[in-house]
């Protein structure tokens, strides 16, 4: 610090020590540091009834350092502030206060919400979702063939999750019924394990369909049951042609 200031203090304090403790430029037995070595900050610490001068390389919590020509001084932050750059800008508030625009507040202003992790007032964030993706193909029980009425689904992504006071997210998937022209399942398309030949009972509104499978069938002779199935298939094809599809998606 300022040398002339140090000399002036030595005249004022007859009990000034020459062997000052760490960082002090001048000191007294009663008051501790009176001035500091260059770049160190001077702060008064209250010990009982007296104040002791201390020299530090940086100011303690709740204080900030200012460099003047004659002294580098630690100045107290505002009462509700733990860490600050200066009196105008708090960077961390004391417990129970929320930081907003460099100030410490008991409650966050209208339109903002308290973040209890960072102890800051933050903008309320509402949910944001993407546009709907295209409808999926019309399916039934995971298959795209062998039926007439199924369901199709579309999804959208959550682009921004809402904060505590933000608007909740709308549904991210939608399902609707669809009708398609029946498409015969190709060999292996139904993907039944072990190629079970056992016929499934028809679903409500869905007629039986023969499983074309030549394996294990002895002759080309038709059983009465097979003959009946063939006739029903022909009938169905005529009906399907007459009835237009109402689905918006195509069957792949």
């Amino acid at each position: 610090q300022n040398a002339s200031r140090g000399r002036r203090q030595r005249r004022m304090h007859p009990n000034v020590s020459q062997g000052c403790q760490g960082g002090c430029a001048t000191c007294s037995d009663y008051n501790g540091c009176l001035s500091c070595k260059p770049r160190l900050f001077f702060v008064l610490e209250r010990i009982g009834m007296k104040q002791i001068g201390v020299c530090l390389s940086s100011c303690p919590s709740g204080y900030y350092g200012t460099r003047y020509p004659d002294i580098n001084k630690c100045t107290k932050c505002k009462a509700d502030c733990d860490t600050c750059f200066n009196k105008n800008f708090c960077t961390k508030c004391k417990s129970g206060f929320y930081l907003h625009l460099g100030k410490c507040l008991d409650n966050c202003p209208e339109g903002l919400e308290a973040n209890n992790h960072t102890m800051e007032c933050v903008n309320i964030v509402h949910c944001e979702v993407s546009e709907w993706n295209p409808w999926s193909p019309c399916t039934k029980k995971g298959k795209t063939c062998g039926f007439k009425r199924g369901t199709e689904t579309r999804v959208r992504e959550i682009m921004q999750h809402p904060s505590a006071k933000g608007n909740l997210c709308p549904p991210t998937n939608e399902t609707r019924k669809c009708t398609v022209q029946r498409k015969k399942c190709q060999k292996g398309e139904r993907g039944k394990k072990g190629r079970e030949r056992k016929r499934k009972k028809p679903n409500k509104g869905e007629s039986k369909e023969a499983i074309p499978d030549s394996k294990g069938l002895e002759s080309s002779k038709e059983t009465p049951e097979q003959r009946e199935n063939k006739q029903q298939q022909k009938k169905r094809k005529v009906q399907d042609k007459q009835q237009k599809s109402v689905s918006v998606s195509t069957v792949h």
Epitope: Y64, T66, R67, D70, K87
Partner: antibody, heavy 116, light 107 residues
Amino acid sequence: EVQLVESGGGLVQPGRSLKLSCAASGFTFSDYDMAWVRQAPKKGLEWVATIIYDGSRTYYRDSVKGRFTISRANAKSTLYLQMDSLRSEDTATYYCATHDKTFDYWGQGVMVTVSS
Amino acid sequence: DIQMTQSPASLSASLGETVTIECRASEDIYSDLAWYQQKPGNSPQLLIYDVNSLIHGVPSRFSGSGSGTQFSLKINNLQSEDVASYFCQQYDNYPNTFGAGTKLELK
């Protein structure tokens, strides 16, 4: 809302005096160190003087030492700059500002022209 | 006194561009550096303190960096409202000194 309003500027002859005032509102004036900063036409910023919050210490740039005096009236929330022996190089817009390491709040400025 | 040398003195850039302004201190000022913006006809306004801490309300396209003697202010995605003069200031030592300024204009 913090407001700093300067007044007292004008045209003055070299060697004469002028006193600038700065009326502060919207903050606790007596808590803050205050400063005057000037800006010559089409030039940069230049710190002139600072007075600490209670008025007990003042600091000046070398070129104005002995000619300018910074003072404050905390009861009136007003900052002053007494400028004596003015020179042509003192021609500038003078701003009053809070000075706490940085100059956080500024007035709108007042023009001082020193010319014969 | 600590001299603050700012460059360039003026620069012209297009909307959406990134611009960088440099500031050099004549001696080590640690991280005691601030940046100010002064729009035509207005008072200066503090933008950044402690090299890279943005003042509340300053758009995030502004950023500061550096330490010791070399510092810079970067403006990403330049907007028309960024047309102004920019000044650096050191507060490590009295007298607090400013750079001469950089005048930023639109192409």
